[in-house]
């Protein structure tokens, strides 16, 4: 249930985020952290539906 | 796919402690934070607290030093504890994943309804 | 803790009709990252929550387009454009700005008239 760093804002997040590329803001310590410490759904296959829409990049939230 | 399964007694007498099992297939818990949500009679949702991905907890602190929420990562499988039950905490219990990205609630187990009684 | 107002508690609709819900918050839910974390379940009968709407107006995977959130700051409308039996349950607002801990609204039945 993990992605890779998340290397550029998107859209989504007017604010600059205090993480570097490799890491995520982690909301409930209010600190970056590896991103693979938080999950988010996976991809899936071509074709099926995603548990939330998602680009390749997402905003360090 | 995520699943999780609650399990546990489904009455627990007054001044007692209730102890909940939560079962997670498809992802480990070492990532995220895992939940413990109840909901009242009258539809009422509290939020209990968390075990994090490095271990750490949250307890709300309506519940006081009643809560404990603790994990096997060898099982992949994390618990609560609450002592001193009253019919007050008669509830349906609910574990939960958290979304790291939007940090809503995205996968939740079926619940199981514990009563307490004499 | 933030406190999740939502009205009416009971909301008969007819099947076809337009319902909408209110949630308000006791203080704003835009964080400082300019996000709002605010998100809808809906229960239905005998099932766990599911998530309908997250960060007050995208729609969660598979829900259908008549579903639609909006509001901002404190003030938030769940809209279903045309009741279907299969919408009926409690629709709850959750709050996920200033956690720990995560609060919800009261619940919102959606029945049949």
């Known amino acids: 249930m993990r992605r890779g760093p998340r290397s550029l804002r998107g859209r989504d997040a007017p604010a600059p985020t205090p993480c570097v590329p490799a890491e995520c803001f982690d909301l409930l310590v209010r600190h970056c952290v590896a991103c693979g410490a938080l999950r988010t759904p996976r991809p899936k296959p071509a074709g099926a539906s995603s548990p939330a829409p998602r680009t390749a990049l997402q905003p360090q939230e | 796919d995520v699943q999780l399964q609650e399990s546990g007694p489904s009455l627990v007498k007054p001044s007692q402690t209730l102890s909940l099992t939560c079962s997670v297939t498809?992802?480990?818990?070492?990532?995220?934070?895992w939940n413990w949500i109840r909901k009242f009679p009258g539809n009422k949702l509290e939020y209990m607290g968390y075990i994090s991905y490095s271990g750490s907890t949250y307890y709300n602190p309506s519940l006081k030093s009643r809560i404990s929420i603790t994990r096997d990562t060898s099982k992949n499988q994390f618990y609560l504890q609450l002592l001193s039950v009253t019919t007050e905490d008669t509830a349906t219990y609910y574990c939960a994943g958290l979304d790291g990205l939007y940090w809503y609630f995205d996968v939740w187990g079926a619940g199981t309804l514990v009563t307490v009684s004499s | 803790d933030i406190v999740m107002t939502q009205t009416p508690l009971s909301l008969p609709v007819s099947l076809g009709d337009q319902a909408s819900i209110s949630c308000r918050s006791s203080?704003?839910?835009?964080?400082?990252?300019?996000?709002?974390?605010l998100h809808w379940y809906l229960q239905k009968p005998g099932q766990s929550p599911k998530l309908l709407i997250y960060?007050?107006?995208n729609r969660f995977s598979g829900v259908p387009d008549r579903f639609s959130g909006s509001g901002s700051g404190t003030d938030f409308t769940l809209k279903i454009s045309r009741v279907e039996a299969e919408d009926l349950g409690v629709y709850f607002c959750?709050?996920?700005?200033?956690?720990?801990?995560?609060?919800f609204g009261s619940g919102t039945k959606l029945e049949i008239k």
């Open positions: 959750s709050q996920s700005t200033h956690v720990p801990p995560f609060t």
């Open positions: 203080q704003s839910l835009v964080h400082s990252n300019g996000n709002t974390y």
């Open positions: 960060k007050v107006s």
């Open positions: 498809g992802d480990s818990i070492t990532s995220g934070y």
